[in-house]
Amino acid sequence: IPLSRTVRCTCISISNQPVNPRSLEKLEIIPPSQFCPHVEIIATMKKKGEKRCLNPESKAIKNLLKAVSKERSKRSP
């Protein structure tokens, strides 16, 4: 789950579960910083605006990132 705060990492738990790119409203990738030493990936779902913290090390999530970036590159001129 994500918690909003000004310091430390945002994600309290992370999920390995694959997410359907079509059901994604937004995908935030937060790089490591002075507050949090690792990458954080927060998916906002279209349904109810539900959010999930995703495990950047998970194969399913790596595949999701590839699919999303491929989709983006298709859209950009």
């Epitope: 789950i1 918690l3 705060r5 990492c9 109810k48 539900e50 999930r52």
Partner: antibody, heavy 121, light 109 residues
């Protein structure tokens, strides 16, 4: 199956210390935030502390801040609660619980059976 | 800190009847952050409802949750003998503490 087993409870004098443990199995412990929740005899549930999956984030109830420390060892699939300067009002059943990782906040979906701490002189 | 109030304190009903339990927050709670738990004597709590209205895995459909803002409701459409227990609501705001309500005891009339 998914399981949490607490241990380390007992009878302790006021001002002394105790360390509770919670052994996790059947799920990816290193992905899950973990909570301690307590219940005084005949009373309701009181949230005590939370630690993030990676041990970076720690949060405490005001009633235990500065006295209790939550920690975890992901290599051992174990959660801990170090309780110092214990008071009579800390007497309770202490539960560890898993923070459901599949959503924004889906509650505490797995609970241990609890371990009893009695603070008495 | 958000304070949760549950009413009634005790609800005396017969099996087959409908139970309506209320949880009121001292300030607005995102519905994503409201959960309900059931606890029977000598047992650990069990998650029933999350996100104010979604049933947790394995929870029968006679349990339903509703509400938003400061007012939330847990409804048990037809009480089964195993439903007599204490029910707690819990909020999980954008930062701790993650408070529980004081509980509602549903007992047999």
């Amino acid at each position: 199956q998914v399981q949490l087993v607490e241990s380390g409870g007992g009878v302790v004098q006021p001002g002394r210390s105790l360390r509770l443990s919670c052994a996790a199995s059947g799920f990816t412990f290193s992905n899950s935030g973990m909570h301690w929740v307590r219940q005084a005899p005949g009373k309701g549930l009181e949230w005590v502390a939370l630690i993030g999956f990676d041990g970076i984030n720690e949060y405490y109830a005001d009633s235990v801040k500065g006295r209790f420390t939550i920690s975890r060892d992901n290599s051992k699939n174990t959660l801990y609660l170090q309780m110092n300067s214990l008071r009579a009002e800390d007497t309770a059943v202490y539960y560890c619980a898993r923070d459901w990782p599949e959503g924004y906040y889906n509650g505490m979906d797995v609970w241990g059976q609890g371990t009893t701490v009695t603070v008495s002189s | 800190e958000i304070v949760l109030t549950q009413s009634p304190g005790t609800l005396s009903l017969s099996p087959g009847e409908r139970a309506t339990l209320s949880c009121r927050a001292s300030q607005s709670v995102s519905s994503s952050y409201l959960a309900w738990y059931q606890q029977k004597p000598g047992q650990a709590p069990r998650l029933l409802i999350y996100g104010a209205s979604s049933r947790a895995t394995g929870i029968p459909d006679r349990f339903s949750g509703s509400g938003s803002g400061t007012d939330f409701t847990l409804t048990i459409s037809r009480l089964e003998p195993e439903d007599f227990a204490v029910y707690y609501c819990q909020q999980y705001g954008s930062s701790p503490p993650f408070t529980f309500g004081p509980g509602t005891k549903v007992d047999i009339k």
